[in-house]
Interface confidence: low
């Protein structure tokens, strides 16, 4: 059962996995929530009453009937591990901790203009999990203005104590906010020579590069495969660090794969989500139960199902036997990894599916593409909205693409003549335009957030933000599409499609059913050329065949570019203006999302 | 077809920063593939300087990798080399080459540009 | 580092010779080592890849054998336009190094 409410002066008693430092309760039951075992925690804060070397601890438990006796103690706060709830869990932690030093190796130190400087510093390098920034305010003059970079091996403070005129706070890489690049990258027949941080069992590379990312140390890995020539070493994961970041040495060896931590880019790839099955293969760990289950699907969901269940094997029934229901076998370590790997026994293999919800929404996978045509089928393009304007009549006004559970991205120009978010309704899930009655379900629109430096769609900044009055509840037909990363900057797109219910040509009529077309983007540079009278901004990314032909048009405003990239949808842009439709040399010109990301989420995260 | 070029001044003073830029054409940097610097003192044999992903990872040779910094411009669809405080011993022709595969790391240099020669003196 | 040490530093050879280049690695590199053909004035032009691997568009006159340290580089049918400097790279560790190159000529 999910339970998110903190328990003030309560202890758990006994069931202690490991303890670490955190400034708060909150955080505290967020680090429960990512470690592997912790289903509940006890936080000491600062009090009096209290000796002062306990607080700011968290001791991380676990046990066996998810819960522990409570004991009454002041400055304790207990609770649970999110790992309980359905919600979505993220790491990210924007707060800042006044008159709190949060301990670890100071591995660089500079000056800077504010906390908010520092802690964008530390976002930007790859080491830094936490800083510590002397305000100026503070007693010792030399030390005045001075940003201390940290590290630690768990990626938590090793020591919080009080000081005075100092604040602290974590990097925001889990909040999608680094300018660090995001190197997909796996390197075969390669092994990255450095040192080892630790080392894990996986059953693939992609499983071993997950477990890198959101291991607070590991900036690359190494994979040695089940090919791999010394037995002993086969499945093993290493996770790596160097001073400089990057692999100083690599050595060509086959059957073995490299490649680095993907922490910058997690916010936009499955991380946590392990969802693979594993043919012919053991996992091996302390066993948590053996049920009956009817496929490797079924046992998967049992172990899913189960909190404390990490991983499982499955052995399939012998011909007729136990009514044709085989073994499912729930497992879990100390880690989450199974301790050893084994092939050839006929066992299915694979993870829980209850830390996907520790990945955004947007990464999971949406029922395949339908080639060909032009009218979309039901489902296809989840995150696409109609937005209508009830006055003076109900009509679609614009298109828009979901987010968030509870946020809308769109085009600014949409709202020209919009007096009052009142008269908005936005509908998702739709297909057919014909679909929507009186009694049509929708969202209603609390309020809207155009970019203040937005004058006209030609001169860029065509992008704003809907905020709905009430969440949306994700299905497979209203979910929310990835922003691209800051750190995928460089990634040429090659699978992109514009879709709305717009006019097919100039003078036309909004359509009734969803349209899609596929189109190429376009650089900006031949861009340019082709809206001599216009600037194209790098704010702004164009799309479109030469010869013409297939384009978005009046209505499809606000809607999405969605691209494909590994196995991803990304909203790379918002369709935004073009000379005519469909012109010849005459692009479609968007929004370019990436160029945003800062300013949505700072507007979509604000407390 | 994959073509490199490389720019910059022909004469430095020593003690100063070399800076060359290798103007890719017929292939977007930002596809793959390492990108590198070798250099070739007159009359010597060849050296490789570094390389570079494009999505910004670096290798260096560890006898230069203090001066040596090679940078990506996937929007100009070029790389740069700097080498600072260099010396009448920094006079070669230099050369930037991509790799041949894709998928691994720095191999085959199967593209190379003409060459540059840059000479150090006062 | 791992040196490439090629042999011999030049030869003299008449055309329709058979000619060898040597090139010893100083620790073992498998068979992670590439032949280049560098002309007077020219860059570098990759012909043997993989130690064995002939590139392609390269004459089949040109081919390399080896493994571990001891690596052999062969023109069965020495040619007028083969007139050039032959480097060995081995690439199985970092940093990348050439052997110092043979130069070749016609007798």
């Known amino acids: 059962e999910c339970v998110t409410q903190l328990l003030k002066d309560t202890c758990f008693e006994g069931g202690d996995i490991t303890t670490v430092f955190t400034p708060s309760a909150k955080y505290c039951q967020v680090v429960c929530t990512y470690h592997p075992r912790c289903l509940l925690f006890t936080f000491t804060a600062e009090s009096p009453s209290e000796d002062p070397t306990r607080w700011f601890t968290c001791v991380l438990k676990d046990s066996v009937t998810e819960t522990l006796p409570r004991v009454n103690r002041t400055a304790a706060i207990s609770g649970y591990s999110f790992k309980q709830c359905s919600h979505q869990i993220s790491a990210c932690n924007k707060d800042i901790y006044v008159d709190l030093d949060m301990k670890g190796i100071n591995y660089n130190s500079s000056v800077a203009k504010s906390a908010q400087e520092c802690q964008e510093r530390c976002t930007d390098d790859v080491h830094c999990h936490f800083f510590t920034y002397a305000t100026r305010q503070f007693p010792s003059l030399e030390h005045r203005n001075i940003c201390l970079l940290k590290h630690t091996q768990t990626g938590t403070p090793t020591r919080i104590t009080k000081l005075d005129k100092v604040v602290s706070g974590f990097s925001l890489k889990s909040c999608a906010l680094s300018n660090l690049a995001c190197i997909r990258d796996i390197f075969p027949n390669t092994v990255f020579a450095d040192s080892n941080i630790d080392s894990v069992m996986a059953p693939d590379a992609f499983v071993c590069g997950r477990i890198c990312t959101h291991h607070p140390g590991c900036l690359f890995f190494t994979f040695f495969s089940q090919e791999w020539p010394k037995e002993s070493q086969r499945n093993l994961c290493l996770l790596k660090t160097s001073e400089s970041g990057l692999p100083s040495t690599r050595i060509k060896k086959s059957k073995a794969l490299s490649g680095f931590s993907l922490q910058s880019c997690r916010h936009s790839i499955p991380v946590f989500c392990h969802s693979s099955f594993y043919h012919d293969t053991d996992f091996l760990g302390e066993e948590l139960d053996i049920v009956a289950a009817k496929s490797h699907e079924a046992c998967q969901k049992l172990c899913t199902n189960a909190v404390r269940c990490q991983f499982f094997t499955y052995t399939p029934a012998q011909a007729s036997c136990n009514e044709g229901k085989g073994k499912c076998y729930l497992k879990l370590s100390s880690n989450g990894s199974p301790t050893k790997i084994l092939h050839g026994r006929g066992g299915i293999s694979g993870y829980t599916l209850r830390l996907c919800k520790m990945d955004n929404e947007c990464t999971t996978k949406i029922k395949p593409r339908i080639v060909g045509g032009t009218a979309s089928v039901r489902g296809e393009w989840p995150w696409q909205v109609t937005l209508h304007t009830t006055s003076p009549t109900q009509r679609h006004l614009c298109g828009g693409s979901i987010i968030g559970n509870q946020w809308i991205l769109t085009a600014a120009h949409c709202f020209y003549g919009v007096e009052s978010p009142k008269i908005l309704r936005v509908y998702s899930g739709i297909l057919n335009q014909s679909e929507i009655k009186e009694d049509t379900s929708f969202f209603g629109v609390q309020e809207i957030i155009i970019h203040d430096q937005y004058k006209m769609a030609e001169s860029g900044y065509d992008i704003a933000l809907l905020k709905l009055e009430t969440t949306v509840n994700y299905t497979d037909s209203q979910r929310p599409i990835c922003l691209p990363s800051k750190g995928d900057r460089n990634v040429i797109y090659t699978d992109c499609w514009v879709t709305g219910w717009g006019y097919r040509k100039l003078r036309d009529k909004i359509q009734n059913t969803l349209q899609k077309a596929k189109i190429p983007l376009v650089t900006n540079e031949e861009c340019q050329k082709r809206y001599r009278g216009h600037k194209i901004t790098h704010k702004m990314i164009c799309a479109g065949y030469r010869e013409g032909g297939k384009d978005a048009c009046k209505g499809d405003s606000g809607g999405p570019l969605s691209c494909k990239h590994n196995e991803v949808w990304h909203l790379v842009g918002i369709t935004s203006w073009g000379e005519g439709c469909a012109q010849r040399e005459r692009p479609g010109v968007y929004t370019n999302v990436v160029e945003y990301v800062d300013w949505i989420l700072e507007k979509t995260q604000a407390v | 077809q994959v073509q490199l070029q490389e720019s910059g001044p022909g004469l430095v003073k020593p003690s100063e920063t070399l800076s060359l830029t290798c103007a890719v054409s017929g292939y977007s940097i930002s596809s793959g593939y390492f990108w590198g610097w070798i250099r070739q003192p007159p009359g010597k044999g060849l050296e490789w300087i570094g390389s570079i992903l494009h999505s910004g990872v670096t290798y260096y040779n560890p006898s230069l990798k203090s001066r040596v910094t090679i940078s990506v411009d996937t929007s100009k669809n070029q790389f740069s080399l700097k080498l600072s405080s260099v010396t009448a011993a920094d006079t070669a022709v230099y050369y930037c080459a991509r790799d041949r595969t894709t998928v691994s790391l720095i191999e085959y240099f199967q593209h190379w540009g003409q060459g540059t020669l840059v000479t150090v003196s006062s | 580092d791992i040196q490439m040490t090629q042999s011999p530093s030049s030869l003299s050879a008449s055309v329709g010779d058979r000619v060898t280049i040597t090139c010893q690695a100083s620790q073992d590199i498998s068979n992670y080592l590439n032949w280049y053909q560098q002309k007077p004035g020219k860059a570098p032009k990759l012909l043997i890849y993989?130690?064995?691997n002939l590139e392609t568009g390269v004459p089949s006159r040109f081919s390399g054998s080896g493994s571990g340290t001891d690596f052999t580089f062969t023109i069965s049918s020495l040619q007028p336009e083969d007139i050039a400097t032959y480097y060995c790279?081995?690439?199985?560790?970092?940093?990348?190094?050439f052997g110092g190159g043979t130069k070749v000529e016609i007798k």
């Open positions: 790279q081995q690439f199985h560790l970092l940093p990348i190094t």
């Open positions: 993989d130690a064995s």
